[in-house]
């Protein structure tokens, strides 16, 4: 049972499982990597271990959820929740990926609209390797940092939006008919 989670650094995170916990379990432990305990609930008490999470985590014994505040990139790891009942254990793994927030993208006009209404735009995030998606009046979503398109004659303004993954920040380029760049 492995769940993947991607979050932005600085945010608060809840690590939990989609299913309900075994009834009347004896012990519940959260691990960071395979050998470091974060917190253990046993005999009605929660014990928080000396770790980089001390003071940043809280366990909800009812749901088994682990709340981590202000996650950092160094918190990237596989977290494991182990539940012990009747001398047998179960494990759930959560692979947490912490990414830095992405700044607002800059849209560069590499080839301006001309009489043929040909347009080439590039969407740039300095020093980041992220996923790009272009939205607008396009035949299909373009998942690339560069948008190239030939526009049909039109009467209304058109906008193309570049969205970068992780923080869902976006930049928009608009122009008005017939084919003049209006704003970006």
């Amino acid at each position: 049972r492995l769940v993947h989670m991607t979050v932005v650094s600085g945010s608060n995170v809840t690590l939990n499982i989609s299913e309900s916990l075994p009834e009347n379990y004896k012990q519940l432990t959260w691990f960071y990597t395979f050998d470091q305990k974060i917190v253990e609930w046993d005999s009605g008490k929660s014990k928080y271990f000396e770790s980089k999470f001390k003071g940043r985590v809280r366990l909800d014994p009812q749901s088994g959820a682990l709340y981590i505040s202000k996650v950092q990139k160094e918190d990237n790891s596989t977290y494991v929740m182990r539940v012990l009942k009747d001398g047998y254990e179960q494990e759930w793994k959560i692979k947490l990926q912490v990414l830095d927030p992405v700044p607002k993208p800059v849209i560069k006009i590499e080839k301006d609209v001309d009489d043929n209404c040909y347009l080439k735009l590039s969407c740039v995030i300095p020093g980041e390797s992220v996923n790009y998606t272009w939205y607008g009046e396009l035949p299909k979503e373009i998942q690339n940092s560069v948008l190239e398109t030939t526009l049909k004659p039109h009467k209304h303004s058109r906008c193309y939006t570049c969205q970068v993954s992780v923080s869902s920040k976006n930049g928009t380029f608009c122009f008005s008919p017939p084919c003049t760049a209006a704003r970006s």
Partner: antibody
Framework: QVQLVQSGAEVKKPGASVKVSCKAS????????MHWVRQAPGQGLEWMGG????????SYNQKFTGRATLTVDKSTSTAYMELSSLRSEDTAVYYC?????????????WGQGTLVTVSS | DIQMTQSPSSLSASVGDRVTITCKAS??????VAWYQQKPGKVPKLLIY???TRHTGVPSRFSGSGSGTDFTLTISSLQPEDVATYYC?????????FGQGTKLEIK
């Protein structure tokens, strides 16, 4: 069925290094941590360290930190234990042992053992 | 590190006897204790885990008990094939540690 097959016996001189391999089969190699336990002649069991084959994360007995190196080759489902700066007290049978759960290092599956003899 | 102290270090008993081996942890390990049997020249074999859960295929004459710092392995009726060295192990906290072993012989 789960099988752990270790490399053959080794004779080494003091100061040398030894690398013991442990080939796993019968289960998904990356889903369980692998550990190394040694046993000197007529002595008890001593845990050396463990490794998560999925990420390469390791945990060592402080006694062996700096001298023991645990690695894995996921493509061949093989775990390795290298021990450097060997001395006569390192003469022992070295076992690889698979944890029953990722976070529960008790050992239901063991390799057959590799005898390492350190002698000048 | 958590020390696991076994007693006795060796014992001799007759076939049919009830045999008890104890293990004391230097600090609370909950129930994260396993017991192993190792016959001469063989690989250790898991008998008990979580202090009292018998591993698959282990005869019912073997039982474990205890929690916190004091643990016991009991063989209710000793059989000739039980001649071996028995080890306790704690897996509550890294580094993992074993007891020094108890060598069991038949009288």
């Amino acid at each position: 069925q789960v099988q752990l097959v270790q490399s053959g016996a080794e004779v080494k001189k003091p100061g040398a290094s030894v690398k013991v391999s442990c080939k796993a089969s019968g289960y998904t190699f990356t889903e369980y941590t692998m550990h190394w336990v040694r046993q000197a002649p007529g002595q008890g069991l001593e845990w050396m360290g463990g490794i998560n084959p999925d990420t390469g994360d390791t945990s060592y007995n402080q006694k062996f930190t700096g001298r023991a190196t645990l690695t894995v080759d996921k493509s061949t489902s093989t775990a390795y234990m290298e021990l450097s700066s060997l001395r006569s007290e390192d003469t022992a049978v070295y076992y690889c042992a698979r944890a029953q759960f990722w976070t529960t290092p008790r050992f239901a599956y063991w390799g057959q053992g590799t005898l390492v003899t350190v002698s000048s | 590190d958590i020390q696991m102290t076994q007693s006795p270090s060796s014992l001799s008993a007759s076939v049919g006897d009830r045999v008890t081996i104890t293990c004391k942890a230097s600090q609370d390990v909950g129930t994260a204790v396993a017991w192993y049997q190792q016959k001469p020249g063989k690989v250790p074999k898991l008998l008990i885990y979580w202090a009292s859960t018998r591993h698959t295929g282990v005869p019912s004459r073997f039982s474990g008990s205890g929690s916190g710092t004091d643990f016991t392995l009991t063989i209710s009726s000793l059989q000739p094939e039980d001649v071996a060295t028995y080890y306790c192990q704690q897996y509550s906290t890294y580094p993992i540690t074993f007891g020094q072993g108890t060598k069991l012989e038949i009288k």
